[in-house]
Interface confidence: low
Amino acid sequence: EEELQVIQPDKSVLVAAGETATLRCTATSLIPVGPIQWFRGAGPGRELIYNQKEGHFPRVTTVSDLTKRNNMDFSIRIGNITPADAGTYYCVKFRKGSPDDVEFKSGAGTELSVRAKPSAPVVSGPAARATPQHTVSFTCESHGFSPRDITLKWFKNGNELSDFQTNVDPVGESVSYSIHSTAKVVLTREDVHSQVICEVAHVTLQGDPLRGTANLSETIRVPPTLEVTQQPVRAENQVNVTCQVRKFYPQRLQLTWLENGNVSRTETASTVTENKDGTYNWMSWLLVNVSAHRDDVKLTCQVEHDGQPAVSKSHDLKVSAHPKEQGSNTAAENTGSNERNIY
């Protein structure tokens, strides 16, 4: 009779993580008598996956009833596959012996490859805010995918970016892989509403890529422009001076009025108006009682925005003649009155 052969008909099997792998194995003869064992890997360090004779293998089920005397199908199923299960599996026939069974013949092996989905990409921006015209870096990371082939793209508001560098680790063979990419983005004043998107495509995603996003509102700082104007006279001896703070982001802003260099009042931006581009405008105003003054007054509007060094704008208030109409009445009625008598 022809000598027993162990046939593993599948050179390779590709399974999605979490799925079940079927590893097929048939013998060509019932002789010699003895059990089958399945191993991952070959040589002395091989790992026992299933032993027909003894042991507990909760993730493994046999395809056929191995207790039947005429059974020659030793295929197994391994449940809940993870990338760590990847490797070459050998079906090995043992000959019954005393005291131990003796390895008789091995199948050619079946390579189990595991397809694992990448994790959702995580995009992170710089630790500190930057102003328009500056270049900032964003990183994107995704982990745990297999096989190694993966595609990563960057977009800003739907437009693909080209200035980025990507690495897939490790370089050699591994059960799963990670991708890390850094993109450079130039900020503009209009970027408060902008988004940076990292898009990852992988064979396991079936054409539906994963995306990670970062809002540039977390990254950008748009410094304000200031304008101090003298408004029309409200009463014979009162002048209304306004400080218009325009086009700033984020909202965190503190304004200080100085009269001839001395601090008059400090306030925090509260009732701001939002522009279409996401930046803010705010206005503060003073009612100055000019009759209490003999000399000209230098009024300074000083603004500290988002913890940055203060910027200021001054206005010289002439008290020798009656105040003339200067500037315009823009939005003055919409803000609270900050009345101040100067003595």
Epitope: P9, V13, V15, A17, S64, D73, G79, N80, I81
Partner: antibody, heavy 123, light 107 residues
Framework: QIQLVQSGPELKKPGETVKISCKAS????????MSWVKQAPGKGLKWMVW????????TYADDFKGRFAFSLETSASTSYLQINNLKNEDTATYFC????????????????WGQGTLVTVSA | DIVMTQSQKFMSTTIGDRVSITCEAS??????VAWYQQKPGQSPKLLIY???NRYTGVPDRFTGSGSGTDFTLTISNMQSEDLANYFC?????????FGSGTKLEVK
């Protein structure tokens, strides 16, 4: 296209034997595993067996060992289910269902189903 | 054997509703779960495989989710043609087992 066509309804008496068939077409029969599924009237689905069409070896659910015999006629691309010593509780619709992939890649959900064969066991 | 429990035998719905059908496995099955729809007198029809993959031609109002032991089939915008029986199935280990089914009825 892929089709599984089952034999017609059967009316049997308790103690008799029934053999129903499932003929496959539109693919290579021995490349895909085949299962049989039972559905009693108004009840759920019970998986009975998976047959390795390559080796002919069946894998049974415990409830279907003994009186149930499953066989193949590969030249005719046909799978058979035979129930011996019929009992009233065997009254059900029996479906054959094919694996979705070449079974080296292992999943076992069912895309392709036969239309079902109603077996009625009544004295 | 792995027991697949569909705790709700019947669910009353309204057309346009969002419906979630749950299935619990008695032990970890990874993502080796499929969902089927069956109408009276018909064979089951595959909707979802690998827990969350929609089968070709299945409307995108059907979505599957879950892994491990807890699985959900969601119909986002219930249609009259969705009134049927729904079964989950595990194929992680032999014997393959089905849930007992959840029948969707109109209120």
């Amino acid at each position: 296209q892929i089709q599984l066509v089952q034999s017609g309804p059967e009316l049997k008496k308790p103690g008799e034997t029934v053999k129903i068939s499932c003929k496959a077409s539109g693919y290579t029969f021995t490349t895909y595993g085949m299962s049989w599924v039972k559905q009693a009237p108004g009840k759920g689905l019970k998986w009975m067996v998976w047959i390795n069409t390559y080796s002919g070896v069946p894998t049974y659910a415990d409830d279907f060992k003994g009186r149930f015999a499953f066989s193949l006629e590969t030249s005719a691309s046909t799978s058979y289910l035979q129930i011996n010593n019929l009992k009233n509780e065997d009254t059900a619709t029996y479906f054959c269902a094919r694996d979705p992939h070449y079974y080296g890649s292992s999943p076992a959900w069912f895309v392709y189903w036969g239309q079902g064969t109603l077996v009625t066991v009544s004295a | 054997d792995i027991v697949m429990t569909q705790s709700q035998k019947f669910m009353s719905t309204t057309i346009g509703d969002r419906v979630s059908i749950t299935c619990e496995a008695s032990q970890i099955v990874g993502i080796a779960v499929a969902w089927y729809q069956q109408k009276p007198g018909q064979s089951p029809k595959l909707l979802i495989y690998s827990a969350s993959n929609r089968y070709t031609g299945v409307p995108d109002r059907f979505t599957g989710s879950g892994s491990g032991t807890d699985f959900t089939l969601t119909i986002s915008n219930m249609q009259s043609e969705d009134l049927a029986n729904y079964f989950c199935q595990q194929y992680s280990a032999y014997p393959f087992t089905f849930g007992s089914g959840t029948k969707l009825e109109v209120k």
